[in-house]
């Protein structure tokens, strides 16, 4: 890749670690990183926020949108359809409250996160709130006998997976409640297991169970998931985060349930166990994107290997040009504290440096005391990390890995990104109907934000999944003359970019357009000075 001219223009982008960006080697690039070099205004990484009691009011949602939330995640492990319908309504009300100013309006996507095929324990002594203490070294019998479904205690524990005795062996580990409690199987019966408590603790009702290494044969899509997915179609959600995906056929089953009416919903597969990691390539091929769900993954595979899985999955998604989300415990301490730990700050930054398209908040925004601060913190860290990416090497590798193609859109995308580096462009403006042109540009990871202009609201919302895309929704009526309509949308993008501080008069931007109306015709790249 050609290096940018150091004297090129006066674009804001020059303060974005430009000295480091021009280094000849990765080590030299690291040596040149400068804590006093401010990042540009735009943040390229998407921020996904889980909505819960701490954040579901319209007022809080408005503030979260202002703070940088791009996607609202609804966790269907909890809550009724009525509860989630209300949340969706609130997200849309908050989003549309900014609609009066098309230049500052931000489309916010809605994501439905499925419960998935979970294994859960029964009720402790008939109560949803009761707890018992499991002592290290104690014997605990696991039973499938429904008589104990609501009568679990420190001696006997019922769980809802009927085949557990077939899939675990003597010596197998069983983890309960996010791995806080660990049991080792000592004896197997037809419908019971005798285990020893290896790691004790307080056990509550209906806790999740993990069976690392076991070939768990639960259906990919439970009856509850089916109803939830259909509810999602009815509610017009933009994406599904499909839990515990283990193989490609699981993804196809989700796609089948979404049906014809849900054809446009993106399926993001959550990789949460060893089988999912092992069969990653087939899952990636079947999915629209991937979520590195580090919570369950860290129980199902050794904790010290989670970072390897993260890097591998992000790398393969980047290579394939599919979006990847990094999730779980990113700013966990901010549930209770207004500032993250230094380790959490580094974790967010390193996810961005690894190449994640989006970063996610869970309890931080759903139930935490500082939801807005958590969003703002992710925004600030992501911006700094993006400035520190060694684009010289990254673009070179992405370009080399891309197959030779005669697809005009693909070729134009590569050229646009290269040109944007060469002339330090303030942005790349893309006119897109389906979003494909913008996705292809994003695949090559430009430093400049990609302002994707579309008239399709869902295209705009779904574009947040891709690193670098800043979607803007054009609501102006279509002009009769195609060239005039192109100019209208490009000018709209120019106004948005200037209002947002992405560039100013005299900077240059790259503009990508088609040669005729419709999808699939993007083939024209122009370098345009900002008027």
């Amino acid at each position: 890749m050609s290096k940018p001219h150091s004297e090129a223009g006066t674009a804001f982008i020059q303060t974005q670690q430009l000295h480091a960006a021009m280094a000849d080697t990765f080590l030299e690039h690291m040596c040149r990183l400068d804590i006093d070099s401010p990042p540009i205004t735009a943040r390229n990484t998407g921020i996904i926020c889980t909505i819960g009691p701490a954040s579901r009011s319209v007022e809080t949602l408005k503030e979260m949108i202002k703070s940088g939330m791009n996607v609202a995640r609804l966790n269907f492990s909890h809550g009724t359809h009525e509860y989630h319908a209300e949340t969706i309504k609130n997200v849309r009300t908050a989003t549309e409250s900014f609609a009066s100013d098309p230049i500052l309006y931000r489309p916010v996507a809605v994501a439905l996160d499925t419960k998935g095929p979970e294994i859960r324990t029964g009720l402790i002594k008939g109560s949803g709130t009761a707890e018992v203490e499991l002592k290290k070294g104690a014997t605990l019998k696991i039973t499938l006998d429904n008589a104990y479904m609501e009568k679990c205690d420190e001696n006997i524990l019922w769980l809802d997976y009927k085949n557990i005795c077939k899939v675990v062996e003597v010596g197998s580990k069983i983890y309960v409640d996010d791995g806080l409690i660990s049991l080792q199987v000592k004896q197997k019966g037809a419908d019971f297991l005798v285990t020893e408590v290896e790691n004790g603790g307080s056990l509550g009702s209906k806790k999740g169970v993990n069976l690392p290494g076991a070939a768990v044969d639960l259906p990919a899509v439970s009856e509850k998931d089916i109803q939830d997915l259909k509810f999602g179609v009815e509610q017009d959600v933009d994406m599904v985060f499909a839990s515990f995906i283990r193989k490609a056929s699981d993804v196809h089953e989700v796609r089948k349930v979404l049906g014809e009416k849900g054809k446009n919903i993106k399926i993001i597969s959550k990789i949460e166990n060893h089988e999912g990691v092992r069969r990653f390539d087939e899952i990636l091929e079947a999915s629209d994107g991937i979520m590195v769900a580090r919570g369950d993954l860290g129980i199902e595979i050794p904790a010290e290997k989670v970072f390897l899985a993260q890097k591998m999955m992000i790398g393969r998604c980047n290579r394939a040009g599919k979006p990847v989300i990094c999730a779980t415990q990113m700013l966990e301490s901010m549930i209770k504290k207004p500032r993250p730990t230094r380790a959490e700050g580094s974790d967010v930054a390193n996810a961005v440096l690894d190449g994640a398209d989006c970063i996610m908040l869970s309890g931080e925004t759903a139930k935490g005391d500082y939801p807005l601060e958590a969003v703002r913190m992710q925004h600030l860290i992501a911006r700094e990390a993006e400035a520190a990416i060694y684009h010289l090497q990254l673009f070179e590798e992405l370009r080399r890995l891309a197959p030779i193609t005669s697809d005009p859109t693909e070729a134009t995308a590569v050229g646009a990104v290269e040109a944007s580096f060469k002339c330090c462009s303030g942005a790349i403006i893309v006119l897109t109907k389906s979003g494909r042109s913008a996705h292809q540009v994003a695949r090559y990871r430009p430093r400049a934000p990609i302002i994707a202009v579309t008239r399709n609201p869902q295209t705009a919302r779904q574009a947040h999944l891709y690193r670098g895309i800043f979607p803007v929704l054009c609501k102006d009526p279509v002009q009769e003359a195609w060239a005039e309509d192109v100019d209208l949308r490009v000018n709209f993008a120019m106004n948005v970019g200037k209002a947002r501080g992405f560039f100013k008069k005299g900077d240059v931007v790259i503009v990508l357009t088609g040669w005729r109306p419709g999808s699939g015709f993007t083939n024209t790249m122009r370098v345009v000075p900002v008027p």
Partner: antibody
Framework: EVQLQQSGPELVKPGASVKLSCTAS????????MNWVKQRPEKSLEWIGR????????LYDQKFQGKATITADKSSTTAYLQLSSLTSEDSAVYYC????????WGQGTTLVTVSA | DVVLTQTPLSLPVSLGQPASISCKSS???????????LNWLQQRPGQSPKLLVY???NLESGVPDRFSGSRSGTDYTLKISRVESEDLGVYYC????????FGSGTKLEIK
């Protein structure tokens, strides 16, 4: 388990109208499209049209425009097919189906038009 | 509208032998998400149709693995590796890419 229960057989006079029903149980129909399909004896399946029960939008094969009207009632999770100006050509089995993973089918309703 | 052309209209086959049904589409059924919106249905005599294969090549749960679906461009094929008596009936290709979905059907009968 999702099931589609269709109304019983109909014996009707030529020129009359008829309204067939299809009720989904264990399922909220607004998350899918409901299709109606015609099958004459020993013949292939013919698509009549479909409805989006969430908003009432319907779509018909040109051949059935003016002949068929598809409606839905969200609250009772029921879809309806009304056929007007019946002739012997309309005698067939009518199926409701939704794309619940590429179609869940009702058991079919037999319609026979008979002269007085 | 998409036109699905199914061949043959009738397929006499001996039990235990393989069978192959073809369906040609007048246009691509690959949607923008990269998936192929073509399914195969089976209709046994006197029964409602039932889903066999979805998204061109995925077997519906409970369907025997002697059935398989494949795609080559706009040509789709349903194969039965060894025909059994319960397989007799009419097979339809059906697309959910756009409306007017059905092929003309192929009747599988015993030779």
């Amino acid at each position: 388990e999702v099931q589609l229960q269709q109304s019983g057989p109909e014996l009707v006079k030529p020129g009359a109208s008829v309204k067939l029903s299809c009720t989904a149980s264990g399922y909220n129909i607004t998350g899918t499209y409901m299709n109606w399909v015609k099958q004459r004896p020993e013949k292939s399946l013919e698509w009549i049209g479909r409805i989006d029960p969430a908003n009432g939008d319907s779509l018909y094969d040109q051949k059935f425009q003016g002949k068929a009207t598809i409606t839905a009632d969200k609250s009772s999770t029921t879809a309806y097919l009304q056929l007007s100006s019946l002739t012997s050509e309309d005698s067939a089995v009518y199926y409701c189906a939704f794309d619940y993973g590429g179609h869940n089918w009702g058991q079919g309703t037999t319609l026979v038009t008979v002269s007085a | 509208d998409v036109v699905l052309t199914q061949t043959p209209l009738s397929l006499p086959v001996s039990l235990g032998q393989p069978a192959s049904i073809s369906c040609k589409s007048s246009q691509s059924l690959v949607y923008s998400n990269g998936k192929t919106y073509l399914n195969w249905l089976q209709q046994r005599p006197g029964q409602s149709p039932k889903l066999l294969v979805y998204l061109a090549s995925n077997l519906e749960s409970g369907v025997p693995d002697r059935f398989s679906g494949s795609r080559s461009g706009t040509d789709y094929t349903l194969k039965i590796s060894r025909v059994e008596s319960e397989d007799l009936g009419v097979y339809y290709c059906v697309q959910s890419y756009t409306h007017v979905p059905f092929g003309s059907g192929t009747k599988l009968e015993i030779k």
